[in-house]
């Protein structure tokens, strides 16, 4: 439906508070280095302009597109060239090229200082002094560090952030109340950001068809009682929402997401029996709840898939008439019967089915050719099952930290050219699959594990894309979205890698390690482990374990010493020498 003024339309639909928050998120995600105050000023100017358009949709410039209005506003930033370099060239372009240019300059790993959490009293004072500024600053800091964060979901996080401060700043023990809540929000936020990053990568790198296939599979698992036509409608609407958010159209995205939640709740009876509680919540909670809702029960007595997709005489006719619809029906029918499969496995099965039909429907005897297609699925199903079984056994044997270390070694040997911080971050996250998924029963392990690994490997892919250093990473990341994990799993030690020169400075530690949190200390040790493997890729597990055990003992000893710094200096030299000898460096 055409509106005379798009900006007035969105302002009225979303309300002033959400409008301002979403514009702030949009601007912070585009200009990630700009100071908070500059963004607030721009947002206020856009908001005042929007209000004039609400009052009179025919007023000057009110008919302009949101991209034009927002892009013009961003291009008024005085320091654009100095701060962003070539991104300033975007401003010489016309829409829609200008917006595409801004999107291409989003930085997944911006050079921003780590967010340090102030003392609880300091935070509570800031919250009480100016609640609005405090919450805006939260949106700004998250959005600039996570330029693809799902904007309507960030509004939900901000609402929870506000609730945590409102409750805990009045509590007797503010810290005990607030800190666990902030930790939970931080961890959930990182997970939410990574999940959304995969959706955007799917759309931007592999296209709408790939995203729709993912959505058909996931929604069919979640809503197995819904008809195919209903699932198809939800997929179309969901694709529009995510295309908009990934494209920087945050106002449209939030508006359409609200409409989708409304539609789902109005049509619960034909979608899922699990939506009742979600649909009683306010908008932001409702949308979040729907996105996380558990799978509905499978309908009883679903017929065999073979009847429609192998035995029917109409298989090739139906496929030829509407390929994507027929494959969509296959994916829907398979997914609703298999909540125990990962989405990526379901997509691999659908791809195998498609490849078989492409070959067989052009053959002399199509039916004879595709009759055994379901037999081809067996190894595809068994591969992730076996991998998960093996890795869960290893996790249970080692615990999370040592399991992460095993993965660090494994992945450093596969792709040693990747930067150490990236290898540490990605391997630590890969290792979290153990505590996240291995506790589940068999029927829930694969969807938990493999779909989580897809999210984590996408982090590796987007970080590597910024500064590509490994052809093997590029190949696994770009060839097939659904085969990324098997591609990385299949990589062996990179025999072409020339070991890194030994640098004693890399293995020099100081007393500051003693004051670090357990997590930070682990990261220091894991960084050293990656560097060790880069120096000695052929080192055995036993050699590496011995060196790491010595290292842990060294840190523990020096942190207990009276003169910590001297201990680190003297014992450190001994440790380096002993490690070099042990590894034959």
């Amino acid at each position: 439906d055409a509106h005379k003024s798009e900006v007035a339309h969105r302002f009225k639909d979303l309300g002033e508070e959400n409008f301002k928050a979403l514009v702030l998120i949009a601007f912070a995600q585009y200009l990630q280095q700009c100071p908070f105050e500059d963004h607030v000023k721009l947002v206020n100017e856009v908001t005042e302009f929007a209000k004039t358009c609400v009052a009179d949709e025919s007023a000057e410039n009110c008919d302009k597109s949101l991209h034009t209005l927002f892009g013009d506003k961003l291009c008024t930033v005085a320091t654009l060239r100095e701060t962003y370099g070539e991104m300033a060239d975007c401003c010489a372009k016309q829409e829609p090229e200008r917006n595409e240019c801004f999107l291409q300059h989003k930085d997944d790993n911006p050079n921003l200082p780590r967010l340090v959490r102030p003392e609880v009293d300091v935070m509570c004072t800031a919250f009480h002094d100016n609640e609005e500024t405090f919450l805006k600053k939260y949106l700004y800091e998250i959005a600039r560090r996570h330029p693809y964060f799902y904007a309507p979901e960030l509004l939900f996080f901000a609402k929870r952030y506000k609730a945590a401060f409102t409750e805990c700043c009045q509590a007797a023990d503010k810290a005990a109340c607030l800190l666990p809540k902030l930790d939970e929000l931080r961890d959930e936020g990182k997970a939410s950001s990574a999940k959304q990053r995969l959706k955007c990568a799917s759309l931007q790198k592999f296209g709408e068809r790939a995203f729709k296939a993912w959505a058909v599979a996931r929604l069919s698992q979640r809503f197995p009682k819904a008809e195919f036509a209903e699932v198809s409608k939800l997929v179309t609407d969901l694709t529009k929402v995510h295309t908009e958010c990934c494209h920087g159209d945050l106002l449209e995205c939030a508006d359409d997401r609200a409409d989708l939640a409304k539609y789902i709740c109005e049509n619960q009876d034909s979608i899922s029996s699990k939506l009742k509680e979600c649909c009683e919540k306010p908008l932001l909670e409702k949308s979040h709840c729907i996105a996380e809702v558990e799978n509905d029960e499978m309908p009883a007595d679903l017929p065999s898939l073979a009847a429609d997709f192998v035995e029917s005489k109409d298989v090739c006719k139906n496929y030829a008439e509407a390929k994507d619809v027929f494959l969509g029906m296959f994916l829907y029918e398979y997914a609703r019967r298999h909540p125990d499969y990962s989405v990526v496995l379901l997509l691999r099965l659908a791809k195998t089915y498609e490849t078989t039909l492409e070959k067989c429907c052009a053959a002399a005897d199509p039916h004879e050719c595709y009759a055994k297609v379901f037999d081809e699925f067996k190894p595809l199903v068994e591969e992730p099952q076996n991998l998960i079984k093996q890795n869960c056994e290893l996790f249970e044997q080692l615990g999370e930290y040592k399991f992460q270390n095993a993965l660090l070694v494994r992945y450093t040997k596969k792709v040693p050219q990747v930067s150490t911080p990236t290898l540490v971050e990605v391997s630590r996250n890969l290792g979290k699959v153990g505590s996240k998924c291995c506790k589940h029963p068999e029927a829930k392990r694969m969807p938990c594990a493999e779909d989580y690994l897809s999210v984590v490997l996408n982090q590796l892919c987007v970080l590597h894309e910024k500064t590509p250093v490994s052809d093997r990473v590029t190949k696994c990341c770009t060839e097939s979205l659904v085969n990324r994990r098997p591609c990385f799993s299949a990589l062996e030690v990179d025999e072409t890698y020339v070991p890194k020169e030994f640098n004693a400075e890399t293995f020099t530690f100081h007393a500051d390690i003693c004051t670090l949190s357990e997590k930070e200390r682990q990261i220091k040790k894991q960084t050293a482990l990656v560097e060790l493997v880069k120096h000695k890729p052929k080192a055995t597990k036993e050699q590496l374990k011995a060196v790491m055990d010595d290292f842990a003992a060294f840190v523990e000893k020096c942190c207990k010493a009276d003169d910590k710094e001297t201990c680190f200096a003297e014992e450190g030299k001994k440790l380096v020498a002993a490690s070099q000898a042990a590894l034959g460096l």
Epitope: S232, N318, Y319, A320, A322, M329, C361, A362
Partner: nanobody, 123 residues
Framework: QVQLLESGGGKVQPGGSLRLSCAAS????????MVWVRQAPGKGLEWVST????????VYAESVKGRFTISRDNAKNTVYLQMNSLRAEDTAVYYC????????????????RGQGTLVTVEP
Amino acid sequence: QVQLLESGGGKVQPGGSLRLSCAASGFTFSTSGMVWVRQAPGKGLEWVSTISDDARITVYAESVKGRFTISRDNAKNTVYLQMNSLRAEDTAVYYCATYRAGSRIGSYEDYYRGQGTLVTVEP
């Protein structure tokens, strides 16, 4: 909007040949499967033949197999039906059709269809 325009029908003797054409517009022809269906006087729609988007897959009803050939030219947005060894029972209005989003595959009443071209086979 989707438009399908059939041509090439006419009156022919048993054993004769005709070539039907269907010019398509208003949709992405090169990514759409195309279908010929027919309706004999006083009967329902009957599927005749299907061709995939890239022309690699062609499927025929048993009643026309070996006599009819479906083909397409994606550069011209046109689909063809070459009909040889025509029989009296082939007499019908022939429609060119393509899948309409939201319809059931094979439910030809719901597909986009042209106005049809009449083929009459009689001595």
